[in-house]
């Protein structure tokens, strides 16, 4: 079959980085600088895509395959293929269109990207706070009020996480 | 004959979006690119970007990537250039052009007329 | 972007005079210019690519040469159907592909 289409169809022998050239009565020319193709039999080659402006290379382009990009320190990929890059935030921020702006009293956000999301409610679930929310953390729930009466088994609250490196005081 | 037929041209006013076609026959749609160029009134002709029908690729000119966008329908042999939130200074006729492994414009459209103005 | 410009931007001549109008990048090119033809109304139509090269069905009397930054189009003898507006497009560097201004072609 490969043979007959290869009859047929001069193209299907170019292989990937290179296209099949109309100028050159069909043969397979190398695809031009600063661009590539990534499948054989193709007719043209493509442009490299540029990683410009906060875009940095991520991997150069090459005959055979496009450049990716990711973004530079500050910003994050959004999008497929890291099509966008959008501004980091604090933890316990979120980006708007004025910039980042502290989360909400009741909203938290834990990572430098994404929107500030409201605290947990625990007494849906029946649970008490263990642990208040702030802007950064969520609340942590504990057991239920009943759960606390005399004779229950008490939960201890986790210890503070210290820096690494420290050694207890 | 081969040849490329540019519609969806027309005035519209500033903040607007139109959508321009380009049809393509008498040669295999998917073996060449689909660019777009414009040439506004007494300026220079300028290249706004491209779509390769073959796999829906595109590059654009960075002045007009955020507005534009470029697709095709294959079962049509017809690209799309959609254009938002036009400016009076859009104002031009666009062209489409066929480009394959090379990057000069083989074959042009006739070109539609884009006015935009309030 | 390169910047693409042509000189002069208008032209007068007859009908039989050899004509040359140029065309300078603003960096090397290489060879990879083209020329294109436009009437009034029409679509440009591509004559010559790979800065020498005339493209199918182009008579024999445009010629282009040139490579780097300096090219030229030459029509040896003109004809009537020849007087138009010519640009050149360099299609060597990253997007965009860029094209001179034009040179207007006109009867004197």
């Known amino acids: 079959f490969e043979r007959t289409r290869s009859l047929q169809d001069p193209c299907s022998n170019c292989p990937a980085g290179t296209f099949c050239d109309n100028n050159r009565n069909q043969i397979c020319s190398p695809c031009p600088p600063n661009s590539f193709s990534s499948a054989g039999g193709q007719r043209t080659c493509d442009i490299c895509r540029q990683c410009k402006g906060v875009f940095r290379t991520r991997k150069e382009c090459s005959s055979t395959s496009n450049a990716e990009c990711d973004c530079t320190p500050g910003f994050h990929c959004l999008g497929a293929g890291c099509s966008m890059c959008e501004q980091d935030c604090k933890q316990g921020q979120e980006l708007t269109k004025k910039g980042c702006k502290d989360c909400c009293f009741g909203t938290f956000n834990d990572q430098k990207r994404g929107i500030c999301r409201p605290w947990t409610n625990c007494s849906l679930d029946g649970k008490s706070v263990l642990v208040n929310g702030t802007k950064e953390r969520d609340v942590v729930c504990g057991p239920s009020p009943a759960d606390l009466s005399p004779g229950a088994s008490s939960v201890t609250p986790p210890a503070p996480a210290r820096e690494p490196g420290h050694s207890p005081q | 004959e081969v040849q490329l037929l540019e519609s969806g041209g027309g005035l519209v006013q500033p903040g607007e979006s139109l959508r321009l076609s380009c049809k393509a026959f008498g040669y295999t749609f998917t073996n060449h690119h689909i660019n777009w160029v414009r040439q506004a009134p007494g300026k220079c002709l300028e290249w706004v970007g491209y779509i390769n029908p073959y796999n829906d690729y595109t590059t654009f000119n960075d002045k007009f990537k955020d507005r534009f966008t470029l697709s095709v329908d294959k079962s049509k042999s017809t690209a799309y250039l959609q254009m938002n939130s036009l400016r009076a200074e859009d104002t031009a006729v666009y062209y489409c052009?066929?480009?394959?492994?090379?990057?000069?414009?083989?074959?042009w459209g006739q070109g539609t007329l884009v006015t935009v103005s309030s | 972007n390169i910047q693409m410009t042509q000189s002069p931007s208008s032209l007068s001549a007859s009908v039989g005079d050899r004509v040359t109008i140029t065309c300078r990048a603003s960096?090397?090119?290489?060879?990879?210019l083209a020329w294109y033809q436009q009437k009034p109304g029409k679509a440009p139509k591509l004559l010559i690519y790979?800065?020498?090269t005339r493209a199918t069905g182009v008579p024999s009397r445009f010629s282009g040469s040139g490579s780097g930054t300096d090219f030229t189009l030459t029509i040896s003898s003109l004809q009537p159907e020849d007087f138009a507006t010519y640009y050149c497009?360099?299609?060597?560097?990253?997007?965009?592909?860029?094209f001179g201004c034009g040179t207007k072609l006109e009867i004197k």
């Open positions: 497009q360099q299609y060597n560097n990253w997007p965009p592909w860029t």
């Open positions: 052009a066929r480009t394959w492994g090379h990057w000069y414009f083989d074959l």
């Open positions: 960096q090397s090119v290489s060879s990879n």
């Open positions: 790979d800065s020498s």
